[in-house]
Interface confidence: medium
């Protein structure tokens, strides 16, 4: 079976002039997933991102996250890239506080 992830992109204040953007994927199966941040369509270097482990979410599916710190005002240049079971999608940083997108393939 394959269950596509729900992708949730959030932002939070980090320090003056910077924000932390977090991309969470949840409810997916199997556990193999690629989640990373891209700037202008190019993957950020590994050292500038932080990842959570892939963990069971209690419903027979899995969850994980990736975060990075960016300059406030440049949000539109960043997208979260997700690949799962041969399908992929990109998710923008919300202009408000929270944006929830269900992947549809």
């Amino acid at each position: 079976r394959t269950v596509p992830p729900m992708v949730n992109v959030t932002r939070s204040e980090a320090s003056e002039g910077n924000i932390t953007v977090t991309c969470r994927a949840s409810g997916f199966y199997p556990w193999n997933i690629t989640l990373s941040w891209r700037q202008d369509g190019v993957s950020l270097s590994h050292d500038t991102q932080q990842w959570g482990d892939v963990l069971p979410d209690g419903n027979g599916t899995y969850q994980t996250w990736v975060a990075t710190r960016i300059c406030q005002g440049e949000e539109q240049r960043f997208t979260c890239y997700m690949e799962h079971s041969g399908n992929h999608s990109t998710h923008p940083v919300p202009s408000g506080k929270v944006l929830v997108l269900q992947s549809h393939w």
């Epitope: 193999n32 690629t34 932080q50 990842w51 482990d53 963990l55």
Partner: antibody, heavy 119, light 108 residues
């Protein structure tokens, strides 16, 4: 800095249980999983199994009937137990950290410990 | 299980030359889960390239990786003396996670 160190008996008798520990530092056992891999003398690498951060395990089917991987967070240690060993289990045994953003690649390895199975 | 076949088994080249190492999978592997390791005698393997084409931390840019599906390649543009070692490809696409048998890169 991140370090992993395997330890255990260098000699195990046939039919007995091989027991190794992997002591780690520089990262949290509740944040990273660990793999066990072995390498027979002069040969290639073979994946034995791994433990996730929630202590669930995933084993190579070739070992599943006789392998146990566990974690003791209070000691910063992972352990490997392989029962009913034979001479074919003689190998260098490695523990390696499961990287996050490296898409499950093994980003840090211990130096390995040689285990010889012989009577 | 997914079998990874590396070729050639041994590659004899001189410093300064270009090395091309191949890894062929018995079934398709997501490019995200195909990695390369370098192992020198008496040492543990070291992560070289992750997700087909991304350099691991501290790896010089003379190393590069490419490929998709079942065919993957590791290239060293200009060999340095310290590059002579055994190279393994590794798939984390499907359990059991497997390694190729290795390519030994030796000095000619």
């Amino acid at each position: 800095q991140v370090q992993l160190q395997e330890s255990g008996p260098g000699l195990v008798k046939p039919s007995e249980t091989l027991s190794l520990t992997c002591t780690v530092s520089g990262f949290s056992l509740t944040t990273y999983g660990v793999h066990w891999i072995r390498q027979p003398p002069g040969k290639g690498l073979e994946w034995i199994g791994m433990i996730w951060t929630d202590a669930t395990t995933d084993y190579n089917a070739a070992f599943i009937s006789r392998v146990t991987i566990s974690v003791d967070t209070s000691k910063n240690q992972f352990s490997l137990k392989l029962s009913s060993v034979t001479a074919a289990d003689t190998a260098v045994y490695y523990c390696a950290r499961k990287g996050h953003g490296y898409y499950y690649a093994m980003d840090y390895w211990g130096q390995g410990t040689l285990v010889t199975v012989s009577s | 299980e997914i079998v990874l076949t590396q070729s050639p088994g041994t590659l004899s080249l001189s410093p300064g030359e270009r090395a091309t190492l191949s890894c062929t999978a018995s079934s398709s592997v997501s490019s995200s889960y195909l990695h390369w390791y370098q192992q020198k005698p008496g040492q543990a393997p070291r992560l070289l390239i992750y997700s087909t084409s991304n350099l691991a931390s501290g790896i010089p840019d003379r190393f590069s990786g490419s490929g998709s599906g079942t065919d993957f390649t590791l290239t060293i543009s200009r060999l340095e003396p310290e590059d002579f070692a055994v190279y393994y490809c590794h798939q984390y696409h499907r359990s059991p996670f497997t390694f190729g048998q290795g390519t030994k890169l030796e000095i000619k």
